[in-house]
């Protein structure tokens, strides 16, 4: 978001008429309230970064994120008999990703058409609310999953209904929290008509000068409360987990668990480095610069960081892969275009040939699902 200049002589309330047009003159329109952007911001809004690079990234995220998270949600809801806390958190993670990714065709079209939003104020607000909602939901559910993974290693007790209920309660609390913290994004007017560029932007230009300080305080609060604190918890969980796995006995099974745990840690670390850290850092820096200088010199970086934050919808399936046996099996079979039933039949014939020898690494049973490493 960049700071737009309100050219209305009467000023405007928090939610007011922005791109209202009174009458047409020649080929243009006469605007009642108008916003102006600086040349650098205009060059970003009309340049290849926003009109070519962003739609490419969003298309990749949509093409990868929609089917993988859709399959994950289906697996966790209908193909996993025992709903362990990890399964519950991953199902919520997949749901958060889907709720964000389903709006991407509109986002892609918006950027391809030169950052011109033609779908109305309400849809823009929904898109932005879900965009940020997904990022913060992902951070919180990832934190829950990380803490839960550590808890499983420290306290390797069987599945209990109580644990699942606690996980459901925590998940509902997270959804409620995210709904509350994203309310300002739904309330604030996000679409602005820029006469100089003849485009209506969605979230890319800040509608109110009065909002500059509010937006800075808002994103700073979110960066501290919904990013830094959960990031610290996640990091702590993984540091303790590595310590536990290092000190544990090294048999073949625990070695596999350790390798998978390391892969999970690397995946989550990558997610923080690519998706969450740059976006949260640049959100704060960007709004601080607008608040203090009236313009942001990091606007292009901020745009890229927000774009990269959506990659979490593509990285999350790797988390499911390293945590859930069921998802791992369904993912393998989907990629190999095989059904789970076919694989099960193959396994039955293999086990009958090899007598009663167990192959734990290929276990895909829905009744005896293990979601630990």
């Amino acid at each position: 978001t960049i700071q737009g200049t309100n050219r209305s002589s009467k000023g405007r309330s928090l939610i007011g008429k922005v791109d209202g047009t009174s009458h047409v003159t020649g080929k243009g329109v006469t605007v009642e309230t108008v916003f102006s952007v600086d040349e650098f911001s205009a060059s970003v809004l009309t340049g290849k970064l926003t009109t070519v690079f962003l739609p490419i990234v969003y298309t990749i995220v949509f093409v990868v994120g929609l089917p993988s998270n859709g399959m994950a949600l289906w697996v966790f809801l209908f193909r996993t008999k025992k709903k362990h806390p990890a399964v519950i958190y991953m199902a919520n993670l997949a749901l958060a990703d889907l709720l964000s990714v389903i709006w991407f065709p509109l986002k892609i079209a918006y950027h391809i058409h030169g950052n011109n939003w033609i779908y109305g104020e309400a849809l823009c607000n929904v898109l932005i609310g879900f965009f940020y909602g997904n990022m913060y939901c992902s951070i919180l559910f990832m934190t829950c999953l990380s803490v839960q993974r550590y808890w499983v290693i420290v306290n390797p007790m069987g599945h209990s209904r109580k644990k699942a209920n606690i996980a459901i309660g925590i998940s509902l609390a997270i959804w409620l929290l995210i709904l509350l913290v994203t309310i300002p994004l739904y309330v604030v007017k996000q679409t602005i008509f820029i006469p100089a560029l003849n485009i209506t932007t969605c979230h890319d230009v800040l509608p109110e000068q009065l909002l500059v300080g509010d937006m800075f305080n808002y994103f700073l609060s979110l960066a501290i409360g919904v990013f830094l604190f959960p990031a610290f918890l996640t990091a702590s969980a993984y540091v303790l987990m590595i310590r536990m796995l290092r000190s544990s006995a090294m048999d073949e099974n625990s070695e596999k668990k350790r390798k998978r745990a390391i892969k999970l840690i690397v995946t989550v670390l990558a997610m923080y480095l690519i998706c969450f850290t740059p976006s949260n850092l640049l959100l704060v820096v960007h709004y601080f610069l607008i608040k203090s200088q009236g313009q942001s010199h990091v606007y292009a970086l901020y745009i890229v960081a927000l774009c990269l934050s959506t990659l979490n919808s593509c990285i999350d399936p790797f988390v499911y892969y390293f945590v859930s046996h069921d998802f791992r099996d369904h993912a393998k079979n989907a990629l190999l275009c095989r059904s789970v039933r076919t694989v099960k039949q193959m396994q039955v014939s293999l086990t009958s040939k090899k007598h009663s020898r167990k192959s734990s690494s290929y276990s895909s049973s829905s009744t005896t699902v293990k979601t630990s490493y």
Epitope: V31, S36, V37, D38, P195, A196, Q209, G294
Partner: antibody
Framework: QVQLVQSGAEVKKPGSSVKVSCKAS????????VIWVRQAPGQGLEWMGV???????YYAQKFQGRVTITADESTSTAYMELSSLRSEDTAVYYC?????????????WGQGTLVTVSS | EIVLTQSPATLSLSPGERATLSCKAS??????LDWYQQKPGQAPRLLIY???SLATGIPARFSGSGSGRDFTLTISSLEPEDFAVYYC????????FGGGTKVEIK
């Protein structure tokens, strides 16, 4: 070089309209906006309105409904029409070039057109 | 609407003296403030834009400073041709001119 040449002085009756022209040279009207400013005798400068290179316009609230700014790219001329003239509209009207962006000033000005409203 | 207040209304100085003109905004305009010079019977001429950037062809004796709400135009050593009316203009939120400061020969 960049130049803005305005039409000559006008004497108008109250209630009538006046149309002031501003011919641009040395730059394209499709790439630049033109703003209009007026100055009553012995008074300060007053911003009236703007037309962008793409034809979009915006007027100061004080003049909304009375002012119309247009541009003709073929002749590189911008126009400002003020209707329902009153005696207090007696002023020198200036046009100026503007790049259309927030961080750009009004860098080149026309010589001004004196409009006298008198019965 | 942002109101710009220029002071003093009139500044009486001799050639060679330093002139300091003030422009105060009713709210933060960041760096988006320009200075214009106007001589009798002439159109305004851009001197300084975005607080401190010197416009093309303007002598180095003119300089601008400030940020936020308080801005200053300084003429280090007045030349005879510098005696005129000076206006500030903010373009951060709307376009508004200050009332002007007349720099006259003492």
């Amino acid at each position: 070089q960049v130049q803005l040449v305005q039409s000559g002085a006008e004497v108008k009756k109250p209630g009538s309209s006046v149309k002031v022209s501003c011919k641009a040279s040395g730059f394209s009207l499709s790439s630049y906006g033109v703003i209009w400013v007026r100055q009553a005798p012995g008074q300060g400068l007053e911003w009236m309105g703007v037309i962008w290179g793409n034809g979009n316009t915006y007027y100061a609230q004080k003049f909304q409904g009375r002012v119309t700014i247009t541009a003709d790219e073929s002749t590189s001329t911008a126009y400002m029409e003020l209707s329902s003239l009153r005696s207090e509209d007696t002023a020198v009207y200036y046009c100026a070039r503007w790049r259309g962006y927030k961080d750009y000033p009004f860098d080149y000005w026309g010589q001004g057109t004196l409009v006298t409203v008198s019965s | 609407e942002i109101v710009l207040t220029q002071s003093p209304a009139t500044l009486s100085l001799s050639p060679g003296e330093r002139a300091t003109l003030s422009c105060k905004a009713s709210q933060n305009v960041y760096k988006y403030l320009d200075w214009y010079q106007q001589k009798p019977g002439q159109a305004p001429r851009l001197l300084i834009y975005n607080t401190n950037s010197l416009a093309t062809g303007i002598p180095a004796r003119f300089s601008g400073s400030g940020s936020g709400r308080d801005f200053t135009l300084t003429i280090s050593s007045l030349e005879p041709e510098d005696f005129a009316v000076y206006y500030c203009l903010q373009h951060n939120s709307g376009w508004t001119f200050g009332g002007g400061t007349k720099v006259e020969i003492k």
